[in-house]
């Protein structure tokens, strides 16, 4: 099926006892009001984690929490939630997030592997990359489409829910 | 290829009770929800309930709780329906379907055939 | 719950003839309509979901169309492996719900 962004109407948001869900998929709080990482399905009648449609695409409902999801699995790269973006940490070490200190610090050690601006940084020649905002700019770019399908899905423990195998 | 293997007919007695499977292949079973719909003879499909199976989650049509228990194995990538305290009303084909979360069923079983009879 | 009404129980028509089968909805379903074929022996495929989105596999000729309470479903150019019960299911609300079925039969 291809991506439908849907907002169902109707929906019912009963549940009775008996019916289980142990994960706390089902809130028991009204239609589509839903905790965060989670989507209202109107079919099944109760609350799904966004990482069960992450493989699928029909995922314009998480399309955020997705984007996220693969940006996190690649290495050197975070996702900034206010710019709903995946973001390369080599275009911002100097300026960088905690998100990147990792990455940044490894790569200020070994200079070798640094990009030219970097280098340059490292001997004096600071290139100011930051807005007046104090955020970066430089950015890798990668829009709605940096969703793929994630295949062999591996999750942190922090992340509730699902793990694929 | 996705597949949903369903188990074979039955013929049980009234009073008793069934469990039936449905083991799929091709797709990650526990990443997908599963449900299990009624046909009696001649008429229309009744949607019984569905499960999750990676956490065992499961909601009923009014109609068949009590009747139905939805149970899966991950390890196997097999759901279950058991059917308890049969009646000759519980003789019907159920089918197992794969939610495709797009508010449809894509992928069938074959169905099993129930019979009711003393 | 919401009720699916498919008013032509059967259908007789020739090879080669454009056929169409209705299925109302007792209320607004948006485009939340999917319609399943169910062939004599029992096995059972998604068409079509969304109104008019083909499933994969599902041959062109099969088309689908309409909005809100009112749904059709085309097959413009008949062959025999199409006789078959067609059945719509609303995917708009829980619980799902289906139509009772067209049977459709080579006149």
């Known amino acids: 099926m291809s991506g439908l962004g849907r907002s169902r109407r109707g929906g019912r948001s009963r549940v009775d006892q008996e019916e289980r869900f142990p994960q706390g998929l089902w809130t028991g709080v009204a239609m589509r009001s839903c905790p965060e990482e989670q989507y209202w399905d109107p079919l099944l009648g109760t609350c799904m984690s966004c990482k069960t449609i992450c493989n699928h695409q029909s995922q314009r409902t998480c399309a955020a929490f997705c984007r996220s999801l693969s940006c996190r699995k690649e290495q050197g790269k975070f996702y900034d939630h206010l710019l709903r973006d995946c973001i390369s940490c080599a275009s911002i070490c100097g300026q960088h997030p905690k998100q990147c200190a990792y990455f940044c610090e490894n790569k200020l050690r070994s200079p070798v592997n640094l990009p030219p601006e970097l280098r340059r940084q490292r001997s004096g020649e600071v290139e100011n990359n930051s807005d007046n905002s104090g955020r970066y700019q430089g950015l890798e770019h990668r829009g709605s489409e940096a969703s793929p399908a994630l295949p062999g899905l591996k999750l942190s423990a922090d992340q509730v829910a699902l793990v694929y195998s | 290829e996705v597949q949903l293997q369903q188990s074979g007919p039955e013929l049980v007695k009234p009073g008793s009770s069934v469990k039936m499977s449905c083991k799929a292949s091709?797709?990650?079973?526990?990443?997908?929800?599963m449900h299990w719909v009624k046909q009696k003879p001649g008429q229309g499909l009744e949607w019984i309930g569905y499960i999750l199976p990676y956490n065992d989650g499961t909601k009923y049509n009014e109609k068949f709780k009590g009747k139905a228990t939805l149970t899966s194995d991950k390890s196997s990538s097999t759901a279950y329906m058991e059917f308890s305290v049969l009646t000759s009303e519980d003789s019907a084909v159920y089918y197992c379907?794969?939610?495709?979360?797009?508010?449809?069923?894509?992928?069938w079983g074959q169905g099993t055939a129930l019979t009711v009879s003393s | 719950d919401i009720q699916m009404t498919q008013t032509t129980s059967s259908l007789s028509a020739s090879l080669g003839d454009r056929v169409t089968i209705s299925c109302r909805a007792s209320?607004?379903?948006?485009?939340?309509l999917n319609w399943y074929q169910q062939k004599p022996d029992g096995t059972v495929k998604l068409l079509m979901c969304y109104t008019s989105r083909l499933h994969s596999g599902v041959p062109s000729r099969f088309s689908g169309s309409g909005s809100g309470t009112d749904f059709s479903l085309t097959i413009s150019n008949l062959e025999q492996e199409d006789i078959a019960t067609y059945f719509c299911q609303q995917g708009n609300t829980f619980p799902p719900t289906f139509g009772g079925g067209t049977k459709l039969e080579i006149k």
């Open positions: 209320q607004d379903i948006s485009n939340y």
């Open positions: 091709g797709y990650t079973f526990t990443n997908y929800v």
């Open positions: 379907a794969r939610y495709d979360y797009e508010g449809s069923f894509d992928y």
